[in-house]
Interface confidence: low
């Protein structure tokens, strides 16, 4: 902690100026009145502080503020900002966009994947549901941070905004981020023809359930084997030889060079050897000809 | 297919203005940022900007922040990039291009304002 | 504002020959959040405007050839032709979309022996 002493006369702070670049971590921790430091949040980023003096800013702001800093601080942190951890920052309370930005900006080539992701949470939770500008801004300067989101939060996005989400910007959802996504952008673009529908609802299609995947293998949209490899293993298992090739269109030859990898290995599996031929790749590991195929899941169900 | 047709070649006087305009086509026209990039004759590229057509809001190299004004017309699918105080060094050619996410997918074909009293 | 620094200037190929752009950040351009590196590779033809070849640095565009490839990550960056052909003559600018300004290199002027 820092040592407690009392300030020089000749060191009294009376603005957040350069001269207290001088100042050593005790003089700023005696001289520095924490409501002035608030008051003049915006100056503290255009001074040069070290790392150990922005430490002693940042206490002095947490004693002023235990439950919290108000998001006029917030909006001026700059690259105070680097010092927060996620503990502090579930404290906040932000729902402007410019904020936001702020910060993002701060944290660009810093380690701060947690911090970015707790903020982020904060505005979703003060802007009380993630609308069409969050995600604006969050595709504009944070790239792949949408998928930082929980799915609980992700569920507060309206179908309206979907429109907005960027390819990318899914890059690095997960499984249960997809399940939550992928209903609401079936949604947002279903007036679409089928050609448009599949390239607006590819990126998303990690939530696709086996139904709708059947669906667009009638469709002729020739799936790349990159979204078909991120496809739920659930609603790849059920989908026959001839679905899958209808599925994949000319792609259907890039199953070869993924045959040992998820989800590919488990279909093919599940299906049997002869059905598997009749594609020319050599696929092989399916159930042997003449074998009787009995789904026991089904038959506990019964029982 | 995607096009961006920019309006025709310019030439202004020092401490003029110019507006080149930028009409796209083959897409939906708020879905995507317009950039602006300019080319002096014989040198390399430089980002001015751009605007995010749907909510109008726009980010500006600092270079220009004081000099260029991005707007969009949404009736007429039509990106603008208005110029002010010009000089000499400014004689460009002045692309708006779509983004693809931030990198420059599509470009115009380009509008050569030239400056000279 | 990040400085992108390529190398060489200007680059004279054989035909059927490889070629090779180097491309420097003054920053790194990898976005840890999403493990992407926000830099892209533009093509200029003489009298045209530039074109796009690879973005996220190594994603090709759809309907460049596969002989262009973009590799690198952090700071530093590469462009390679497998084996150049005379349609590939021109200047060769790599940028950075990963932060505000996006900034591009100075270019690198690719001719044919």
């Known amino acids: 902690d820092v040592e407690r002493t009392t300030c020089p006369p000749e060191k009294e702070v009376h603005e957040i100026d350069e001269s207290l670049i001088f100042y050593k971590k005790r003089e700023l921790e005696a001289c520095v009145d924490a409501a002035l430091l608030a008051a003049q949040m915006d100056r503290v980023d255009a001074i040069p502080f070290t790392y150990e003096q922005l430490d002693v800013l940042k206490h002095k702001l947490d004693e002023l503020y235990p439950q919290g800093y108000p998001e006029s601080v917030i909006r001026h942190l700059g690259h105070l900002f680097l010092k927060m951890s996620p503990e502090d920052i579930r404290k906040w309370n932000v729902t402007s966009l410019e904020t936001l930005k702020a910060l993002l900006k701060v944290s660009k080539g810093h380690e701060m994947s947690a911090q970015v992701a707790t903020l982020i949470d904060r505005v979703v939770v003060g802007r009380g549901q993630l609308d069409k500008d969050t995600v604006d801004t969050l595709t504009a300067f944070c790239p792949g941070c949408l998928c930082s989101l929980s799915p609980e939060r992700l569920s507060s996005v309206p179908p309206s905004v979907i429109g907005a989400v960027r390819p990318q910007d899914l890059d690095t959802c997960g499984p249960r981020q997809l399940d939550v996504l992928y209903p609401k952008a079936r949604l947002a673009f279903q007036n679409m023809s089928g050609s448009e529908y599949f390239v607006k609802i590819r990126p998303f299609l990690g939530g696709a359930p086996t139904e709708d995947v059947k669906a667009l293998s009638q469709q002729n949209v020739s799936m790349d084997l990159a979204t078909f490899m991120k496809l739920r293993r659930e609603a790849v298992l059920p989908l026959t030889v001839a679905e899958v090739q209808k599925l994949l269109g000319p792609h259907v030859e890039g199953l070869k060079v993924e045959e040992q990898h998820s989800p590919v290995r488990d279909w093919i599996l599940k299906q049997r050897q002869d059905d598997l031929d009749t594609l020319g790749l050599g696929l092989q590991g399916g159930i042997p000809n003449g074998y009787l195929i009995l789904d026991l899941s089904v038959r506990e169900a019964l029982s | 297919e995607v096009q961006l047709v920019q309006s025709g070649a310019e030439v202004k006087k020092p401490g003029a203005s110019v507006k080149v305009s930028c009409k796209a086509s083959?897409?939906?026209?708020?879905?995507?940022?317009m950039h602006w990039v300019r080319q002096a004759p014989g040198q390399g590229l430089e980002w001015m900007g751009n605007?995010?057509?749907?909510?109008?809001?726009?980010y500006y190299n600092e270079r220009f922040m004081s000099r260029v004004t991005m707007t969009v017309d949404k009736s007429t699918s039509t990106a603008y990039m208005e110029l002010s105080s010009l000089r000499s060094e400014d004689t460009a050619v002045y692309y708006c291009?779509?983004?693809?996410?931030?990198?420059?997918?599509?470009w115009g074909q380009g509008t050569l304002v030239t400056v000279s009293s | 504002d990040i400085v992108m620094t390529q190398t060489p200037l200007s680059l004279s190929v054989t035909p059927g020959q490889p070629a090779s752009i180097s491309c420097k950040s003054s920053?790194?351009?990898?976005?840890?959040?999403?493990?992407?590196?926000?830099l892209a590779w533009y093509q200029q033809k003489p009298g045209q405007s530039p074109t796009l070849l690879v973005y996220?640095?190594?994603t090709r565009e759809s309907g460049v050839p596969d002989r262009f490839s973009g590799s690198g990550s952090g700071t530093d960056f590469t462009l390679k032709i497998s084996r150049v052909e005379a349609e590939d003559v021109g200047v060769y600018y790599c940028?950075?979309?990963?932060?505000?300004?996006?900034?591009f290199g100075g270019g690198t002027k690719v001719e044919i022996k």
């Open positions: 291009a779509r983004s693809g996410g931030l990198w420059l997918a599509f």
């Open positions: 083959g897409y939906t026209f708020t879905n995507y940022w």
């Open positions: 605007i995010n057509p749907s909510s109008g809001d726009s």
């Open positions: 920053q790194t351009l990898l976005n840890s959040v999403s493990q992407n590196n926000y």
């Open positions: 996220f640095a190594s």
């Open positions: 940028q950075q979309h990963y932060r505000t300004p996006y900034t």
